[in-house]
């Protein structure tokens, strides 16, 4: 397993519409056909699995159906959305890549992105 | 290095507004936020708000908003807070501050003063 | 919204001697998300901690932070002449981010 470099903005405040998009960039070292996106979310000591990707260089990223990550990728970069977030789903998401194909295998963890997320006010009663 | 360089002091009248300035420089923008706080006079600390230079979005106190505005040029990494229908009680010293997510760089301060 | 309340509200000390400051939250600070600021009169405040007790750089290790949930504390363990001012803490895990009233460290 060797090491690659992997950036992603420090810090973005989710839409009011609870969605949050960013870029995760990798150094790649060789010219990879298949690649393997992960979004982890670390929060109070406890890392989850956000959603995952697997993806053929030049091709869409295809996440479960079922998934609240969407993606498109451009070269060496994943252009990540996460939608139907809350205030209770801020944190810090982190970005791994890993270049499965072909060898040598290539694993690269972003810093993270500290997503906030801000629920909207209510609305106010009306009387209609 | 990391500098927040902020516009010079303001004396504005009760009603009008204000509009403060923030250039960042030696990092990357749109990576990181950028928070305003200001202390008004023997005062401490009051939190106003945030961008995110990543994407626009922002998010404002609740005793503030509707009169404040905060945006990003990113073509010059500059951050602007305008503060609308100023009142005395206005009157404060104004921090920019990178959002890392905690507010590891501060700008020097712009003072303004709201006096009839 | 996160109600942070720091104590005392003034400390009177001599040189050489050690601080310890309080911050408590009205609710738990996800992520240990407390930092301390540092204020000297007519200047911008300075991050010394953030993380609840991860030093900023150039912070001198007579610093330190500790604390988890709703109670957190900052030490000063020998006070230098130059670390007479006002402290304040703030939490940035969720939003409204919020700072603390500051409490003063003052010459005895």
């Known amino acids: 397993c060797k090491a690659m470099h992997v950036a992603q903005p420090a810090v973005v405040l989710a839409s009011s519409r609870g969605i949050a998009s960013f870029v995760c960039e990798y150094a790649s070292p060789g010219k990879a056909t298949e690649v393997r996106v992960t979004v982890l979310r670390q929060a109070d000591s406890q890392v989850t699995e956000v959603c995952a990707a697997t993806y053929m260089m030049g091709n869409e990223l295809t996440f479960l159906d079922d998934s609240i990550c969407t993606g498109t990728s451009s070269g060496n970069q994943v252009n990540l959305t996460i939608q139907g977030l809350r205030a209770m789903d801020t944190g810090l998401y982190i970005c791994k890549v890993e270049l499965m194909y072909p060898p040598p295998y290539y694993l690269g963890i972003g810093n993270g992105t500290q997503i906030y997320v801000i629920d909207p006010e209510p609305c106010p009663d009306s009387d209609f | 290095q990391v500098q927040l360089v902020q516009s010079g002091a303001e004396v504005k009248k009760p009603g009008a507004s204000v509009k403060v300035s923030c250039k960042a420089s030696?990092?990357?923008?749109?990576?990181?936020?950028i928070t305003w706080v200001r202390q008004a006079p023997g005062q401490g600390l009051e939190w106003m708000g945030w961008?995110?230079?990543?994407?626009?979005?922002?998010n404002y106190a609740q005793k503030l908003q509707g009169r404040v505005t905060m945006t990003t040029d990113t073509s010059t990494s500059t951050a602007y807070m305008e503060l609308r229908s100023l009142r005395s009680d206005d009157t404060a010293v104004y921090y920019c501050a990178r959002v890392a997510p905690y507010f590891d760089y501060w700008g020097q301060g712009t003072l303004v003063t709201v006096s009839s | 919204e996160i109600v942070l309340t720091q104590s005392p509200g003034t400390l009177s000390l001599s040189p050489g001697e050690r601080a310890t400051l309080s911050c408590r939250a009205s609710q738990s600070v996800s992520s240990s998300y407390l930092a301390w600021y540092q204020q000297k009169p007519g200047q911008a405040p300075r991050l010394l901690i953030y993380g609840a007790s991860s030093r900023a750089t150039g912070i001198p290790d007579r610093f330190s932070g500790s604390g988890s949930g709703t109670d957190f504390t900052l030490t000063i363990s020998r006070l230098e002449p130059e670390d007479f001012a006002v402290y304040y803490c703030q939490q940035y895990g969720r939003s409204p981010f919020t700072f603390g009233p500051g409490t003063k460290v003052d010459i005895k």
């Open positions: 961008i995110s230079a990543y994407n626009g979005n922002t």
């Open positions: 030696g990092y990357t923008f749109t990576n990181y936020g």
